[in-house]
Interface confidence: low
């Protein structure tokens, strides 16, 4: 597995935007053709979505299990770009696609946004404040 190009998670604010020139901005990390911004601020799910958009990137998405294992091993828990309109609706990604995994606690009607934690995805209240990370595909 390719590992981190940079592994210094300093608490300095990272305001650089992901660029499209084939490599990641300074202090973003690289894994399998994607750049990841390691957030430090806590925000609601919607605020996190907007914060990532402002960095020309997307709220963290999980494309496969290998990526999930990699991210869970190096990142603090965070929002991911998965939500549902209610407990009667399916989980979907921010691109509108059906989400590929079952989510912990998903039968609780108040928990409609998804969080990545160690070894697991779980649901949480969208209005609660959580760390967020962003992703940009090279």
């Amino acid at each position: 597995i390719p590992f981190l190009e940079q592994n210094n998670f300093s608490p300095n604010t990272r305001t650089q935007k992901a660029r499209h020139c084939g490599h990641c901005p300074e202090e973003w990390i690289t894994y399998s053709n994607s750049c990841y911004y390691i957030g430090k601020e806590r925000r609601t799910w919607e605020e996190s979505l907007l914060a990532c958009t402002s960095k020309n990137s997307s709220l963290l998405s999980i494309d496969n299990e290998e990526e999930m294992k990699f991210l869970a091993s190096i990142l603090p828990s965070s929002w991911i770009g998965v939500f549902r309109n209610s407990s009667h609706h399916p989980w979907v990604t921010i691109n509108g696609l059906a989400f590929k995994h079952k989510i912990k606690d998903s039968d609780n009607a108040e928990l409609n946004c998804a969080v990545l934690q160690v070894n697991r995805l779980k649901s949480a209240q969208c209005g609660s404040s959580m760390i967020y990370h962003c992703k940009h595909k090279l």
Partner: antibody, heavy 119, light 112 residues
């Protein structure tokens, strides 16, 4: 090493209750679901229920609703199964197992606890 | 609940032979979103607890010999064991984990 250590065998009288324990080592139960599975003598495996130790949320097979109560103590990294109003039908080996979200299958099992209900 | 049916309930083979056992689910355990079959196989040796052999219907658990192979999709699944060894004496259970959790009744493998 990832392990589940179960409490010792129990001999109990009909009508009584019993509580079995399952202590995890090598991982934090808060990161998993903890399950209990019944195996009657010379029979197959029956899922009893599970707990999310992080928040105490439980789910049971309808056949065990009212019979089984699953709890967890994250400070001791232990899951518990309480069986009430015991009858001879409850004589069985009770296994604990863990599953991880995203994966869901039972990748680690305890050695099992034998419960014998007899007067 | 999804019902799991295993066959045969028992079989006896000689060391070195190949065996196949079947598991059928009452409804599909294929999750359309990720095209994964939520089906596992366990081996339970006499006096022991079950041990995970196969998950996602065909992925071998770490440390499991490649003599054990899982196959199938949807509702029909097979566990194949080649070059049977004396230590393979056990009951083999299939298990669906898509909708709650249910196990098959088991197939008991005996060595002639």
């Amino acid at each position: 090493e990832v392990q589940l250590q179960q409490s010792g065998a129990e001999l109990v009288k009909p009508g009584a209750s019993v509580t079995l324990s399952c202590t995890a080592s090598g991982f934090n139960i808060k990161d998993t679901y903890m399950h209990w599975v019944q195996q009657r003598p010379e029979q197959g495996l029956e899922w009893i229920g599970r707990i999310d130790p992080e928040n105490g949320y439980t789910k049971y097979d309808p056949n065990f609703q009212g019979k089984a109560t699953i709890t967890a103590d994250t400070s001791s990294n232990t899951a518990y199964l309480q069986l009430s109003s015991l009858t001879s039908e409850d004589t069985a080996v009770y296994h604990c197992a863990r599953s991880r979200t995203l994966f869901w299958y039972f990748d680690v099992w305890g050695a099992g606890t034998t419960v014998t209900v007899s007067s | 609940n999804i019902m799991m049916t295993q066959s045969p309930s028992s079989l006896a083979v000689s060391a070195g032979e190949k065996v196949t056992m079947s598991c059928k689910s009452s409804q599909s355990v294929l999750y359309s979103s990720n095209q994964k079959n939520y089906l596992a196989w366990y081996q339970q040796k006499p006096g022991q607890s079950p041990k995970l052999l196969i998950y996602w219907a065909s992925t071998r658990e770490s440390g499991v010999p490649d003599r054990f192979t899982g196959s199938g999709s949807g509702t029909d699944f097979t566990l194949t064991i080649t070059n049977i060894q004396a230590e393979d004496l056990a009951v083999y259970y299939c298990h669906q984990y898509l909708s709650s959790y249910t196990f098959g009744g088991g197939t008991k493998l005996e060595i002639k």
